[in-house]
Protein backbone atom coordinates (compact mmCIF):
# COMPACT_ATOMS: atom_id res chain seq x y z
CA UNK A 1 0.00 0.00 0.00
CA UNK A 2 2.24 2.65 -1.17
CA UNK A 3 -0.31 5.57 0.20
CA UNK A 4 0.59 4.40 3.50
CA UNK A 5 4.47 5.08 2.57
CA UNK A 6 4.28 8.83 3.93
CA UNK A 7 2.86 8.16 6.89
CA UNK A 8 4.91 5.33 7.67
CA UNK A 9 7.78 8.05 7.08
CA UNK A 10 6.50 10.36 9.66
CA UNK A 11 6.91 8.44 12.17
CA UNK A 12 10.58 7.33 11.52
CA UNK A 13 11.82 10.94 12.69
CA UNK A 14 9.85 11.26 15.64
CA UNK A 15 11.33 8.53 18.88
CA UNK A 16 7.92 9.41 20.64
CA UNK A 17 5.99 7.41 18.09
CA UNK A 18 6.72 4.20 15.54
CA UNK A 19 4.93 2.27 13.11
CA UNK A 20 2.38 -0.30 13.54
CA UNK A 21 1.74 -2.76 10.30
CA UNK A 22 -0.81 -4.68 11.43
CA UNK A 23 -2.96 -1.39 11.91
CA UNK A 24 -1.18 0.59 9.39
CA UNK A 25 -0.72 3.89 11.32
CA UNK A 26 1.51 5.67 13.51
CA UNK A 27 1.51 4.51 17.39
CA UNK A 28 2.66 6.53 20.67
CA UNK A 29 5.70 4.83 22.26
CA UNK A 30 4.56 4.14 25.72
CA UNK A 31 7.60 5.64 27.66
CA UNK A 32 9.75 3.02 30.08
CA UNK A 33 8.15 1.29 33.16
CA UNK A 34 4.17 2.34 31.27
CA UNK A 35 2.63 -0.37 29.02
CA UNK A 36 0.25 -0.03 26.58
CA UNK A 37 -3.79 -0.35 27.24
CA UNK A 38 -4.56 -1.03 23.59
CA UNK A 39 -2.67 -2.25 20.38
CA UNK A 40 -1.69 1.56 19.30
CA UNK A 41 -1.64 3.62 21.67
CA UNK A 42 -2.47 7.20 20.40
CA UNK A 43 -1.16 9.00 23.50
CA UNK A 44 0.37 8.83 26.84
CA UNK A 45 -3.14 8.54 28.53
CA UNK A 46 -3.20 5.23 26.69
CA UNK A 47 -0.09 3.60 28.63
CA UNK A 48 -0.14 2.43 32.20
CA UNK A 49 1.90 0.95 34.78
CA UNK A 50 2.14 -2.83 34.75
CA UNK A 51 0.91 -4.46 37.68
CA UNK A 52 1.14 -8.15 39.28
CA UNK A 53 -0.79 -11.00 38.62
CA UNK A 54 -4.17 -10.54 40.94
CA UNK A 55 -3.88 -6.59 41.06
CA UNK A 56 -5.69 -3.98 39.28
CA UNK A 57 -4.74 -0.59 38.47
CA UNK A 58 -7.12 1.68 40.42
CA UNK A 59 -8.77 5.21 39.42
CA UNK A 60 -5.45 6.52 41.27
CA UNK A 61 -2.85 4.28 38.84
CA UNK A 62 -2.66 1.95 41.44
CA UNK A 63 -1.57 -1.45 41.77
CA UNK A 64 -4.37 -2.86 43.85
CA UNK A 65 -5.02 -6.44 44.79
CA UNK A 66 -8.37 -7.70 42.99
CA UNK A 67 -10.59 -9.54 45.59
CA UNK A 68 -10.40 -13.50 46.19
CA UNK A 69 -13.22 -15.57 45.97
CA UNK A 70 -11.88 -18.19 47.51
CA UNK A 71 -14.02 -18.83 50.32
CA UNK A 72 -16.03 -21.63 49.88
CA UNK A 73 -19.70 -20.02 49.73
CA UNK A 74 -18.66 -17.40 46.71
CA UNK A 75 -18.10 -17.69 42.98
CA UNK A 76 -16.49 -15.59 40.76
CA UNK A 77 -18.58 -13.25 39.05
CA UNK A 78 -16.45 -11.40 36.57
CA UNK A 79 -12.49 -12.01 36.58
CA UNK A 80 -9.74 -10.06 37.78
CA UNK A 81 -8.88 -7.42 35.01
CA UNK A 82 -6.09 -5.31 34.62
CA UNK A 83 -8.40 -1.91 35.34
CA UNK A 84 -11.07 -3.65 37.66
CA UNK A 85 -11.25 -5.87 40.25
CA UNK A 86 -12.30 -9.61 40.09
CA UNK A 87 -15.96 -9.70 41.87
CA UNK A 88 -17.06 -12.53 43.74
CA UNK A 89 -20.89 -13.71 44.61
CA UNK A 90 -23.04 -15.83 46.64
CA UNK A 91 -22.23 -19.54 45.20
CA UNK A 92 -26.00 -20.68 43.73
CA UNK A 93 -28.53 -21.53 46.57
CA UNK A 94 -27.25 -18.85 48.83
CA UNK A 95 -27.83 -14.46 49.12
CA UNK A 96 -25.47 -11.98 50.59
CA UNK A 97 -26.63 -10.75 53.82
CA UNK A 98 -23.72 -8.59 54.60
CA UNK A 99 -22.18 -7.15 50.96
CA UNK A 100 -18.50 -5.96 50.75
CA UNK A 101 -16.83 -4.17 47.81
CA UNK A 102 -16.88 -6.31 44.62
CA UNK A 103 -17.50 -9.14 47.25
CA UNK A 104 -20.16 -10.20 49.90
CA UNK A 105 -19.04 -10.86 53.69
CA UNK A 106 -21.08 -12.94 54.63
CA UNK A 107 -23.77 -15.46 52.46
CA UNK A 108 -26.38 -17.13 53.91
CA UNK A 109 -28.69 -20.31 52.33
CA UNK A 110 -31.77 -19.12 50.85
CA UNK A 111 -34.93 -19.46 53.18
CA UNK A 112 -37.03 -22.22 52.83
CA UNK A 113 -41.05 -21.20 53.19
CA UNK A 114 -42.91 -22.23 56.12
CA UNK A 115 -45.47 -24.19 56.04
CA UNK A 116 -48.96 -21.44 54.99
CA UNK A 117 -46.23 -19.62 52.66
CA UNK A 118 -45.71 -20.21 49.53
CA UNK A 119 -42.49 -18.51 47.38
CA UNK A 120 -43.35 -14.99 46.16
CA UNK A 121 -39.60 -14.31 44.73
CA UNK A 122 -37.06 -16.94 44.35
CA UNK A 123 -33.60 -15.92 45.95
CA UNK A 124 -30.67 -14.30 44.12
CA UNK A 125 -27.26 -14.63 44.93
CA UNK A 126 -27.88 -10.79 46.30
CA UNK A 127 -31.62 -11.64 47.77
CA UNK A 128 -33.04 -14.09 49.97
CA UNK A 129 -36.29 -16.14 48.93
CA UNK A 130 -39.80 -13.51 49.32
CA UNK A 131 -42.58 -15.72 51.13
CA UNK A 132 -46.37 -14.86 51.08
CA UNK A 133 -49.26 -16.39 52.16
CA UNK A 134 -50.28 -19.30 50.23
CA UNK A 135 -53.98 -17.52 50.94
CA UNK A 136 -54.50 -14.04 51.13
CA UNK A 137 -55.39 -13.12 54.34
CA UNK A 138 -54.28 -16.01 56.14
CA UNK A 139 -51.41 -15.32 58.48
CA UNK A 140 -48.48 -17.97 58.74
CA UNK A 141 -48.13 -19.98 61.80
CA UNK A 142 -45.29 -18.10 64.14
CA UNK A 143 -43.67 -20.82 66.07
CA UNK A 144 -41.71 -18.53 67.98
CA UNK A 145 -40.84 -14.63 68.10
CA UNK A 146 -37.59 -15.75 67.27
CA UNK A 147 -38.51 -16.90 64.10
CA UNK A 148 -41.10 -14.93 62.62
CA UNK A 149 -42.73 -11.71 63.83
CA UNK A 150 -45.12 -9.27 62.76
CA UNK A 151 -44.81 -7.60 59.31
CA UNK A 152 -44.22 -4.21 58.71
CA UNK A 153 -46.81 -2.61 56.48
CA UNK A 154 -46.17 -3.91 52.94
CA UNK A 155 -43.27 -5.88 53.86
CA UNK A 156 -43.87 -9.87 53.75
CA UNK A 157 -42.47 -12.37 56.28
CA UNK A 158 -39.31 -14.57 55.00
CA UNK A 159 -37.69 -17.71 56.15
CA UNK A 160 -35.03 -17.53 58.43
CA UNK A 161 -32.15 -18.42 56.22
CA UNK A 162 -29.69 -20.96 57.07
CA UNK A 163 -26.30 -19.77 57.91
CA UNK A 164 -23.14 -21.65 57.25
CA UNK A 165 -20.97 -23.03 60.06
CA UNK A 166 -18.39 -20.43 60.63
CA UNK A 167 -15.10 -21.67 59.27
CA UNK A 168 -12.09 -20.54 61.27
CA UNK A 169 -9.35 -20.34 59.45
CA UNK A 170 -7.93 -23.73 59.83
CA UNK A 171 -5.77 -24.96 56.56
CA UNK A 172 -6.71 -28.88 57.14
CA UNK A 173 -10.47 -28.31 57.01
CA UNK A 174 -11.07 -24.93 55.02
CA UNK A 175 -12.95 -26.37 52.17
CA UNK A 176 -10.43 -25.50 49.22
CA UNK A 177 -11.98 -24.93 46.03
CA UNK A 178 -9.53 -26.43 43.26
CA UNK A 179 -8.04 -29.30 45.54
CA UNK A 180 -6.79 -30.12 48.15
CA UNK A 181 -3.05 -30.31 47.76
CA UNK A 182 -2.19 -27.05 49.21
CA UNK A 183 -4.55 -26.78 51.85
CA UNK A 184 -2.51 -30.18 52.97
CA UNK A 185 1.09 -28.73 52.44
CA UNK A 186 0.22 -25.46 53.98
CA UNK A 187 -1.00 -27.50 57.32
CA UNK A 188 1.83 -29.15 57.20
CA UNK A 189 4.40 -25.72 56.16
CA UNK A 190 2.57 -23.33 58.66
CA UNK A 191 4.55 -23.10 61.90
CA UNK A 192 2.13 -20.42 64.09
CA UNK A 193 4.72 -18.12 66.63
CA UNK A 194 2.64 -18.13 69.82
CA UNK A 195 -0.71 -16.03 70.12
CA UNK A 196 0.08 -15.28 65.98
CA UNK A 197 -2.77 -15.73 64.23
CA UNK A 198 -3.09 -19.32 62.18
CA UNK A 199 -2.87 -19.32 58.33
CA UNK A 200 -4.93 -20.67 55.22
CA UNK A 201 -3.98 -22.87 52.69
CA UNK A 202 -4.76 -21.18 49.29
CA UNK A 203 -6.36 -22.74 46.32
CA UNK A 204 -4.19 -24.78 44.73
CA UNK A 205 -6.19 -23.19 41.56
CA UNK A 206 -4.60 -20.45 41.63
CA UNK A 207 -1.17 -21.02 41.83
CA UNK A 208 0.29 -17.59 42.03
CA UNK A 209 0.28 -15.64 38.79
CA UNK A 210 -2.71 -15.00 36.73
CA UNK A 211 -2.42 -15.12 32.78
CA UNK A 212 -1.25 -11.48 31.20
CA UNK A 213 -0.94 -10.33 28.00
CA UNK A 214 2.32 -11.92 26.70
CA UNK A 215 4.66 -9.43 26.80
CA UNK A 216 7.06 -10.04 23.51
CA UNK A 217 10.44 -9.03 23.64
CA UNK A 218 10.85 -5.30 23.09
CA UNK A 219 6.99 -4.55 22.99
CA UNK A 220 5.01 -3.06 25.77
CA UNK A 221 1.89 -5.22 25.55
CA UNK A 222 1.95 -5.25 29.67
CA UNK A 223 0.00 -3.13 32.11
CA UNK A 224 1.12 -2.08 35.50
CA UNK A 225 0.24 -5.11 37.71
CA UNK A 226 1.21 -5.96 41.55
CA UNK A 227 2.38 -8.93 43.11
CA UNK A 228 -1.01 -11.02 44.36
CA UNK A 229 -2.15 -10.02 47.18
CA UNK A 230 -0.83 -6.50 46.50
CA UNK A 231 -3.39 -3.29 45.11
CA UNK A 232 -2.59 -0.87 43.13
CA UNK A 233 -3.07 2.84 45.28
CA UNK A 234 -3.88 6.14 44.33
CA UNK A 235 0.03 6.57 44.46
CA UNK A 236 0.36 4.19 41.93
CA UNK A 237 2.17 1.96 44.25
CA UNK A 238 1.97 -1.34 45.09
CA UNK A 239 0.48 -1.77 48.31
CA UNK A 240 -0.51 -5.02 50.70
CA UNK A 241 -4.21 -5.96 50.73
CA UNK A 242 -4.87 -6.62 54.70
CA UNK A 243 -5.43 -9.97 55.49
CA UNK A 244 -8.40 -11.55 57.68
CA UNK A 245 -6.08 -14.53 58.72
CA UNK A 246 -7.02 -13.89 62.07
CA UNK A 247 -9.10 -16.26 63.78
CA UNK A 248 -11.78 -13.46 64.44
CA UNK A 249 -11.75 -12.05 61.44
CA UNK A 250 -13.55 -12.51 58.00
CA UNK A 251 -13.01 -11.35 54.39
CA UNK A 252 -15.89 -8.88 54.06
CA UNK A 253 -14.74 -7.76 50.49
CA UNK A 254 -11.70 -9.77 48.64
CA UNK A 255 -8.30 -8.02 47.09
CA UNK A 256 -8.72 -6.18 44.09
CA UNK A 257 -6.27 -4.98 42.10
CA UNK A 258 -7.36 -1.62 42.60
CA UNK A 259 -8.54 -1.54 46.39
CA UNK A 260 -7.37 -3.69 49.89
CA UNK A 261 -9.31 -6.79 50.81
CA UNK A 262 -11.74 -5.24 53.85
CA UNK A 263 -11.73 -7.17 57.34
CA UNK A 264 -14.96 -7.81 59.95
CA UNK A 265 -15.38 -9.38 62.90
CA UNK A 266 -16.87 -12.84 62.76
CA UNK A 267 -20.21 -13.69 63.17
CA UNK A 268 -20.76 -13.68 67.37
CA UNK A 269 -18.12 -10.38 67.59
CA UNK A 270 -18.46 -6.85 67.40
CA UNK A 271 -15.39 -4.70 66.94
CA UNK A 272 -14.16 -2.71 69.54
CA UNK A 273 -11.04 -1.09 68.54
CA UNK A 274 -11.29 -0.39 64.04
CA UNK A 275 -8.47 -0.11 61.58
CA UNK A 276 -8.35 0.53 58.39
CA UNK A 277 -10.27 -2.14 56.50
CA UNK A 278 -10.70 -4.31 58.95
CA UNK A 279 -10.62 -4.09 62.72
CA UNK A 280 -7.79 -3.95 65.25
CA UNK A 281 -9.74 -6.37 68.50
CA UNK A 282 -12.97 -8.11 68.25
CA UNK A 283 -14.79 -8.96 71.14
CA UNK A 284 -17.48 -11.57 71.86
CA UNK A 285 -20.89 -10.36 71.67
CA UNK A 286 -22.73 -11.20 74.63
CA UNK A 287 -25.07 -13.94 74.54
CA UNK A 288 -28.59 -13.52 75.61
CA UNK A 289 -30.68 -15.44 73.61
CA UNK A 290 -33.67 -15.08 75.96
CA UNK A 291 -33.20 -11.30 76.39
CA UNK A 292 -33.51 -11.18 72.46
CA UNK A 293 -35.86 -8.62 70.86
CA UNK A 294 -36.80 -8.32 67.35
CA UNK A 295 -35.85 -5.08 65.38
CA UNK A 296 -37.91 -4.17 62.47
CA UNK A 297 -36.44 -4.00 59.13
CA UNK A 298 -37.23 -4.49 55.53
CA UNK A 299 -37.90 -8.33 55.28
CA UNK A 300 -37.91 -8.69 51.50
CA UNK A 301 -34.00 -6.88 51.60
CA UNK A 302 -32.02 -8.57 54.81
CA UNK A 303 -32.81 -11.43 57.38
CA UNK A 304 -34.85 -11.21 60.61
CA UNK A 305 -32.37 -8.95 62.76
CA UNK A 306 -32.33 -9.14 66.71
CA UNK A 307 -31.41 -6.37 68.73
CA UNK A 308 -29.66 -7.22 72.04
CA UNK A 309 -30.88 -4.94 74.96
CA UNK A 310 -28.53 -2.71 76.13
CA UNK A 311 -25.26 -3.73 77.56
CA UNK A 312 -25.65 -4.02 81.85
CA UNK A 313 -29.44 -4.67 81.27
CA UNK A 314 -28.90 -8.15 81.27
CA UNK A 315 -28.40 -10.37 83.95
CA UNK A 316 -26.64 -12.92 82.23
CA UNK A 317 -24.69 -11.90 80.14
CA UNK A 318 -20.51 -11.04 79.82
CA UNK A 319 -19.37 -8.81 77.68
CA UNK A 320 -15.73 -9.15 78.71
CA UNK A 321 -13.99 -11.19 76.35
CA UNK A 322 -11.94 -14.19 77.13
CA UNK A 323 -8.98 -12.51 78.13
CA UNK A 324 -10.74 -10.61 81.06
CA UNK A 325 -9.96 -7.26 79.38
CA UNK A 326 -13.03 -5.20 79.08
CA UNK A 327 -13.88 -3.92 76.21
CA UNK A 328 -13.45 -0.69 74.51
CA UNK A 329 -15.98 1.86 73.37
CA UNK A 330 -17.81 0.52 70.46
CA UNK A 331 -17.41 3.37 67.49
CA UNK A 332 -20.68 5.27 67.15
CA UNK A 333 -21.08 3.46 63.64
CA UNK A 334 -21.45 0.06 65.59
CA UNK A 335 -24.71 -0.94 66.60
CA UNK A 336 -25.21 -3.47 68.65
CA UNK A 337 -27.11 -5.64 66.61
CA UNK A 338 -26.80 -9.57 66.88
CA UNK A 339 -28.19 -11.31 63.75
CA UNK A 340 -29.75 -14.72 63.57
CA UNK A 341 -26.96 -16.71 63.55
CA UNK A 342 -24.29 -14.62 66.14
CA UNK A 343 -27.09 -15.50 68.21
CA UNK A 344 -26.17 -19.07 68.21
CA UNK A 345 -22.39 -18.68 67.49
CA UNK A 346 -20.32 -18.46 71.14
CA UNK A 347 -16.80 -17.59 71.22
CA UNK A 348 -14.30 -20.28 71.41
CA UNK A 349 -11.09 -19.29 72.72
CA UNK A 350 -9.21 -21.85 70.12
CA UNK A 351 -8.18 -22.16 66.32
CA UNK A 352 -10.26 -25.39 65.89
CA UNK A 353 -13.34 -25.52 63.58
CA UNK A 354 -16.83 -24.76 65.12
CA UNK A 355 -19.67 -26.52 63.87
CA UNK A 356 -23.01 -25.89 64.88
CA UNK A 357 -25.28 -28.69 66.43
CA UNK A 358 -28.53 -29.60 65.94
CA UNK A 359 -28.99 -28.07 69.74
CA UNK A 360 -27.36 -24.46 68.44
CA UNK A 361 -24.43 -25.11 70.72
CA UNK A 362 -20.76 -25.09 69.18
CA UNK A 363 -19.61 -28.12 68.70
CA UNK A 364 -15.67 -28.33 68.62
CA UNK A 365 -14.02 -30.19 65.28
CA UNK A 366 -11.32 -32.11 65.63
CA UNK A 367 -10.91 -32.23 62.39
CA UNK B 1 12.86 -28.45 45.81
CA UNK B 2 13.11 -24.72 44.62
CA UNK B 3 16.68 -23.83 44.03
CA UNK B 4 18.04 -20.44 43.08
CA UNK B 5 21.42 -20.37 41.31
CA UNK B 6 23.39 -17.74 40.27
CA UNK B 7 26.08 -16.76 37.90
CA UNK B 8 29.78 -15.79 39.22
CA UNK B 9 31.62 -12.83 40.57
CA UNK B 10 32.11 -9.81 38.38
CA UNK B 11 34.32 -7.16 37.91
CA UNK B 12 33.30 -4.16 35.86
CA UNK B 13 34.46 -1.06 34.91
CA UNK B 14 32.49 2.42 35.50
CA UNK B 15 29.94 3.29 32.47
CA UNK B 16 30.22 -0.43 32.08
CA UNK B 17 27.57 -2.87 32.42
CA UNK B 18 26.57 -6.16 34.19
CA UNK B 19 24.44 -9.21 33.51
CA UNK B 20 23.80 -11.38 36.69
CA UNK B 21 21.59 -14.68 35.44
CA UNK B 22 19.66 -16.79 37.88
CA UNK B 23 18.78 -20.32 37.03
CA UNK B 24 15.30 -21.44 38.72
CA UNK B 25 14.53 -25.40 39.59
CA UNK B 26 12.61 -26.91 41.29
CA UNK B 27 8.77 -25.01 40.39
CA UNK B 28 6.96 -24.48 37.33
CA UNK B 29 9.12 -21.27 36.53
CA UNK B 30 6.50 -19.00 34.67
CA UNK B 31 4.11 -19.27 37.74
CA UNK B 32 6.20 -16.90 40.53
CA UNK B 33 8.11 -13.34 39.93
CA UNK B 34 11.74 -13.19 40.25
CA UNK B 35 12.83 -10.48 42.57
CA UNK B 36 16.32 -8.62 42.34
CA UNK B 37 17.78 -7.45 45.54
CA UNK B 38 21.26 -6.17 45.90
CA UNK B 39 23.84 -5.44 49.24
CA UNK B 40 26.34 -3.27 49.31
CA UNK B 41 29.13 -4.63 51.34
CA UNK B 42 28.86 -4.03 55.09
CA UNK B 43 25.17 -2.42 54.48
CA UNK B 44 21.75 -3.13 54.04
CA UNK B 45 19.42 -5.14 51.51
CA UNK B 46 17.97 -2.73 48.47
CA UNK B 47 15.31 -4.04 46.66
CA UNK B 48 15.77 -3.48 42.48
CA UNK B 49 12.94 -4.54 41.17
CA UNK B 50 11.19 -8.16 39.70
CA UNK B 51 10.36 -10.14 36.26
CA UNK B 52 6.35 -11.57 35.64
CA UNK B 53 8.40 -14.65 33.71
CA UNK B 54 5.34 -15.49 32.24
CA UNK B 55 4.57 -12.51 30.73
CA UNK B 56 7.63 -10.78 30.51
CA UNK B 57 7.24 -7.83 32.50
CA UNK B 58 8.99 -6.18 35.27
CA UNK B 59 8.73 -3.15 36.84
CA UNK B 60 11.98 -1.98 38.92
CA UNK B 61 12.54 0.49 42.15
CA UNK B 62 13.10 3.85 40.85
CA UNK B 63 16.35 4.42 42.04
CA UNK B 64 17.54 2.24 39.55
CA UNK B 65 15.08 3.30 36.60
CA UNK B 66 16.87 3.67 33.38
CA UNK B 67 19.66 1.36 34.19
CA UNK B 68 17.97 -1.39 34.88
CA UNK B 69 16.38 -4.45 32.84
CA UNK B 70 15.14 -7.16 34.21
CA UNK B 71 14.49 -10.13 31.71
CA UNK B 72 13.47 -13.74 31.85
CA UNK B 73 14.26 -16.98 29.34
CA UNK B 74 11.57 -19.37 29.84
CA UNK B 75 13.14 -21.99 27.48
CA UNK B 76 15.75 -22.17 30.40
CA UNK B 77 13.94 -20.73 33.43
CA UNK B 78 16.49 -18.13 33.87
CA UNK B 79 16.02 -14.71 35.09
CA UNK B 80 18.69 -11.91 34.02
CA UNK B 81 19.22 -8.71 35.59
CA UNK B 82 21.29 -6.22 33.46
CA UNK B 83 22.55 -3.37 34.88
CA UNK B 84 24.06 -0.39 32.77
CA UNK B 85 25.90 2.72 33.58
CA UNK B 86 27.78 1.23 36.64
CA UNK B 87 29.65 3.14 39.04
CA UNK B 88 31.07 2.33 42.38
CA UNK B 89 28.48 2.26 44.37
CA UNK B 90 26.83 -0.27 42.18
CA UNK B 91 29.77 -2.58 43.94
CA UNK B 92 27.20 -5.55 45.82
CA UNK B 93 26.30 -8.95 46.30
CA UNK B 94 23.36 -8.89 43.77
CA UNK B 95 21.06 -11.72 44.92
CA UNK B 96 17.91 -13.01 43.12
CA UNK B 97 14.91 -14.01 45.40
CA UNK B 98 11.49 -15.58 45.25
CA UNK B 99 8.42 -15.23 47.77
CA UNK B 100 6.84 -18.33 49.44
CA UNK B 101 4.14 -20.48 47.59
CA UNK B 102 1.87 -21.04 50.25
CA UNK B 103 -0.51 -19.54 52.79
CA UNK B 104 -3.48 -18.14 52.24
CA UNK B 105 -1.98 -14.29 50.85
CA UNK B 106 0.66 -14.51 48.09
CA UNK B 107 2.71 -11.35 49.98
CA UNK B 108 6.25 -10.40 48.60
CA UNK B 109 8.61 -11.56 51.23
CA UNK B 110 11.39 -13.84 50.20
CA UNK B 111 11.43 -17.26 51.12
CA UNK B 112 13.90 -18.68 48.50
CA UNK B 113 17.13 -16.75 47.29
CA UNK B 114 19.86 -17.36 44.77
CA UNK B 115 23.50 -17.34 46.56
CA UNK B 116 24.19 -14.35 45.78
CA UNK B 117 26.54 -12.68 42.77
CA UNK B 118 29.25 -10.46 43.91
CA UNK B 119 29.55 -7.19 41.26
CA UNK B 120 32.43 -4.92 42.05
CA UNK B 121 33.02 -2.06 39.77
CA UNK B 122 36.39 -0.48 40.10
CA UNK B 123 38.45 1.61 37.69
CA UNK C 1 8.52 3.37 52.94
CA UNK C 2 11.55 3.99 55.32
CA UNK C 3 12.33 1.11 57.89
CA UNK C 4 14.59 1.83 60.88
CA UNK C 5 16.08 -0.99 62.95
CA UNK C 6 17.50 -0.34 65.96
CA UNK C 7 19.90 -1.16 67.57
CA UNK C 8 22.38 -1.39 64.89
CA UNK C 9 24.91 -3.15 67.14
CA UNK C 10 24.44 -5.51 70.06
CA UNK C 11 26.63 -7.78 72.01
CA UNK C 12 25.28 -10.00 74.15
CA UNK C 13 26.26 -13.90 75.44
CA UNK C 14 24.67 -17.14 75.21
CA UNK C 15 21.10 -17.70 77.20
CA UNK C 16 20.29 -13.80 76.65
CA UNK C 17 17.09 -12.02 75.79
CA UNK C 18 17.80 -9.90 72.52
CA UNK C 19 15.18 -7.91 71.60
CA UNK C 20 15.38 -6.20 68.27
CA UNK C 21 13.20 -3.19 66.87
CA UNK C 22 11.78 -2.21 63.37
CA UNK C 23 10.31 1.27 63.11
CA UNK C 24 8.28 1.90 59.89
CA UNK C 25 7.61 5.67 58.55
CA UNK C 26 4.20 4.76 58.19
CA UNK C 27 1.74 2.25 58.76
CA UNK C 28 2.40 -1.09 57.12
CA UNK C 29 -0.01 -3.48 58.92
CA UNK C 30 1.84 -6.70 60.13
CA UNK C 31 3.34 -7.08 56.07
CA UNK C 32 6.67 -7.20 57.87
CA UNK C 33 9.17 -10.21 57.64
CA UNK C 34 12.26 -10.90 59.29
CA UNK C 35 15.76 -12.37 57.97
CA UNK C 36 18.83 -13.53 59.56
CA UNK C 37 22.07 -12.91 57.60
CA UNK C 38 25.37 -15.34 58.37
CA UNK C 39 28.30 -13.75 56.67
CA UNK C 40 28.45 -14.50 53.04
CA UNK C 41 25.21 -16.49 52.83
CA UNK C 42 21.93 -15.26 51.56
CA UNK C 43 19.34 -14.25 54.01
CA UNK C 44 16.89 -16.83 55.71
CA UNK C 45 13.52 -15.58 56.78
CA UNK C 46 12.57 -16.07 60.37
CA UNK C 47 9.04 -14.28 60.14
CA UNK C 48 6.78 -13.11 58.36
CA UNK C 49 3.48 -11.33 58.51
CA UNK C 50 5.07 -9.70 61.55
CA UNK C 51 3.95 -13.06 64.29
CA UNK C 52 4.74 -16.08 61.75
CA UNK C 53 7.21 -18.45 62.08
CA UNK C 54 8.32 -19.79 59.25
CA UNK C 55 8.74 -23.19 59.12
CA UNK C 56 11.90 -24.89 60.95
CA UNK C 57 12.57 -21.79 62.75
CA UNK C 58 13.23 -22.78 66.34
CA UNK C 59 10.36 -21.30 68.97
CA UNK C 60 13.00 -19.16 70.66
CA UNK C 61 12.07 -16.36 67.53
CA UNK C 62 9.25 -13.98 68.14
CA UNK C 63 8.17 -11.51 66.38
CA UNK C 64 5.71 -9.12 67.33
CA UNK C 65 4.02 -5.68 66.57
CA UNK C 66 1.53 -4.22 63.79
CA UNK C 67 1.68 -0.67 62.69
CA UNK C 68 4.75 0.58 62.70
CA UNK C 69 6.48 -0.71 65.50
CA UNK C 70 7.87 -4.30 65.22
CA UNK C 71 9.90 -6.54 67.18
CA UNK C 72 12.01 -9.57 66.90
CA UNK C 73 12.90 -11.39 70.29
CA UNK C 74 14.86 -14.03 70.58
CA UNK C 75 14.28 -15.45 74.05
CA UNK C 76 17.49 -17.61 74.79
CA UNK C 77 20.43 -16.70 72.63
CA UNK C 78 21.84 -19.78 71.13
CA UNK C 79 25.50 -19.86 69.50
CA UNK C 80 24.31 -20.31 65.90
CA UNK C 81 22.42 -17.06 66.65
CA UNK C 82 24.95 -14.66 66.32
CA UNK C 83 23.98 -13.16 63.26
CA UNK C 84 22.73 -10.28 61.16
CA UNK C 85 19.26 -9.47 61.55
CA UNK C 86 16.96 -7.07 59.12
CA UNK C 87 13.19 -6.14 58.61
CA UNK C 88 11.46 -6.04 55.39
CA UNK C 89 8.20 -4.02 54.61
CA UNK C 90 6.44 -5.76 51.79
CA UNK C 91 3.26 -3.89 52.31
CA UNK C 92 4.06 -1.10 49.53
CA UNK C 93 6.39 -1.14 46.36
CA UNK C 94 8.99 -0.55 46.57
CA UNK C 95 9.72 -2.82 48.88
CA UNK C 96 12.58 -1.82 51.70
CA UNK C 97 14.33 -3.64 54.45
CA UNK C 98 15.64 -2.17 57.47
CA UNK C 99 19.67 -1.19 58.16
CA UNK C 100 20.39 -4.13 59.89
CA UNK C 101 21.13 -5.00 63.46
CA UNK C 102 24.26 -7.33 63.68
CA UNK C 103 24.26 -9.16 67.24
CA UNK C 104 27.59 -10.32 68.52
CA UNK C 105 29.22 -12.26 71.08
CA UNK C 106 30.38 -10.52 74.21
Known amino acids: FPQDRPFEDTCHGNPSHYYDKAVRRCCYRCPMGLFPTQQCPQRPTDCRKQCEPDYYLDEADRCTACVTCSRDDLVEKTPCAWNSSRVCECRPGMFCSTSAVNSCARCFFHSVCPAGMIVKFPGTAQKNTVCEPASPGVSPACASPENCKEPSSGTIPQAKPTPVSPATSSASTMPVRGGTRLAQEAASKLTRAPDSPSSVGRPSSDPGLSPTQPCPEGSGDCRKQCEPDYYLDEAGRCTACVSCSRDDLVEKTPCAWNSSRTCECRPGMICATSATNSCARCVPYPICAAETVTKPQDMAEKDTTFEAPPLGTQPDCNPTPENGEAPASTSPTQSLLVDSQASKTLPIPTSAPVALSSTGKPVLDAG | QVQLVQSGSELKKPGASVKVSCKAS????????IHWVRQPPGKGLEWIGYINPSSGCSDYNQNFQGRVTITADKSTSTAYMELSSLRSEDTAVYYC????????????????WGQGTTVTVSS | IELTQSPSFLSASVGDRVTVTCKAS??????VAWFQQKPGKAPKVLIYSASYRESGVPDRFTGSGSGTDFTLTISSLQPEDFAEYFCQQYHTYPLTFGGGTKVEIK
Open chain 3, 26 to 31: QNVGTN
Open chain 2, 26 to 33: GYTFTTYT
Open chain 2, 97 to 112: ARRADYGNYEYTWFAY
